[in-house]
């Protein structure tokens, strides 16, 4: 899996999505996680609702959310308040059983908030992401979901 | 701000059926879940099912399975129930209720008195 | 299906007082509980989502905690507009339920 970095502003809220293919994960619940270590285990974060017809509403974990739009196949995780703490590598993942796969590999990045006028020494800045061989940077906004964007799975 | 309007006061001869409507104003229609309670007379809440309107299909309570539809209508932004084969045990308020992005119940409609009688 | 049982049936207090509220599952409903406020001839409203966040426009007075089974809602200083009758709803297991709710009158 190549990783895929999302960079945030401190303060701020952060948006992370993973594109699935809605058919070949149908029917699963999945999950943001956090990996401990290269070779560690990925800690649970976050998961989407129990009920999978009800993957569409939010869940929160802290200051963290889950959504997913399991029509469109589109997990979406928000990290509101974002500290440098928050940096890292993560996961989104699909569950089947007590298996996960792997849907993205997420490095967040956080970036001291230009208008902080502290001394921004202590705060964590996220090395160049060339030192990911394969990682894609993506400059997500951040911004609140917009009423007509919260997603929905079909029913039976 | 979500606003649901429901459709006026039924009253109902057993045996017979009752549609109940909820306008919904505010935000994107297709984008929310509608869900239906019940509350007989002095009774507690209810649900009796929901739909994705932009799945068209919809969920709903076992006990209620085969004796409710619940349809939606985009283009009208409106939300239906329709219950049959009634009887005196129906008579109650049937609320709307959408999801905002929290719980499938986060906004209601006012209610709407269903009495059947003989 | 998951049983929500709400004690009391009623509680009586005065305004100023702390009220709280239980709702009980018979199997675990994990944090997947809400509580509603409904007041006579109106339609419910949200209070708490997840057992324990405030949704918007509530109150800090309001709280909610528990998980599994057991859930508590309190009210750290009834207000006048506080008497109504309070239900927990569970969406964890199909069908959804509500409990049959705890009537806070005054005293």
């Known amino acids: 899996h190549n990783t895929t970095v999302f960079q945030g502003v401190a303060g701020q809220s952060l948006q992370v999505s993973c594109p699935y293919d809605s058919m070949k994960h149908w029917g699963r619940r999945k999950a943001w996680c956090r990996q401990l270590g290269e070779k560690g285990p990925c800690q649970r974060v976050v998961s989407t609702h129990n009920l999978w017809l009800l993957s569409f509403l939010r869940r929160w974990n802290g200051s963290t959310a889950i959504t997913d739009d399991t029509l469109g196949g589109t997990l979406t995780i928000t990290l509101r308040n974002l500290q440098p703490h928050d940096a890292g590598l993560y996961q989104c993942q699909s569950l089947h059983g007590s298996e996960a796969d792997t849907l993205r590999k997420v490095l967040v990045e956080v970036l001291a908030d230009p208008l902080d006028h502290r001394d921004a020494g202590d705060l964590w800045f996220p090395g160049e992401s060339e030192s990911f061989e394969d990682a894609h940077v993506e400059h997500s906004i951040s911004r609140s979901l917009l009423e007509g964007e919260i997603p929905f799975p079909p029913t039976s | 701000q979500v606003q649901l309007v429901q459709s006026g006061a039924e009253v109902k001869k057993p045996g017979s059926s009752v549609k109940v409507s909820c306008k919904a104003s505010?935000?994107?229609?297709?984008?929310?879940?509608i869900s239906w309670v019940r509350q007989a007379p002095g009774q507690g809440l209810e649900w009796m099912g929901g739909?994705?309107?932009?799945?068209?299909?919809?969920n709903y309570a076992q006990k209620f399975q085969g004796r409710v539809t619940i349809t939606a209508d985009e283009s009208t932004s409106t939300a239906y129930m329709e219950l049959s084969s009634l009887r005196s045990e129906d008579t109650a308020v049937y609320y709307c209720?959408?999801?905002?992005?929290?719980?499938?119940?986060?906004?209601w409609g006012q209610g709407t008195l269903v009495t059947v009688s003989s | 299906e998951i049983v929500l049982t709400q004690s009391p049936a009623t509680l009586s207090l005065s305004p100023g007082e702390r009220a709280t509220l239980s709702c009980r599952a018979s199997?675990?409903?994990?944090?997947?509980l809400a509580w509603f406020q409904q007041k006579p001839g109106q339609a419910p409203r949200l209070l708490i989502y997840?057992?324990?966040n405030r949704a918007t426009g509530i109150p800090a007075r309001f709280s909610g905690s528990g998980s599994g089974t057991d859930f508590t809602l309190t009210i750290s200083s009834l207000e006048p507009e506080d008497f109504a009758v309070y239900y927990c709803?569970?969406?964890?297991?199909?069908?959804?339920?509500f409990g049959g709710g705890t009537k806070v009158e005054i005293k």
């Open positions: 739909i994705i309107p932009i799945s068209g299909t919809a």
């Open positions: 199997q675990s409903v994990s944090s997947y």
């Open positions: 209720a959408r999801t905002q992005e929290y719980t499938l119940f986060d906004s």
């Open positions: 505010g935000g994107t229609f297709s984008s929310y879940a």
């Open positions: 997840d057992a324990s």
């Open positions: 709803q569970q969406d964890y297991h199909w069908p959804i339920t």
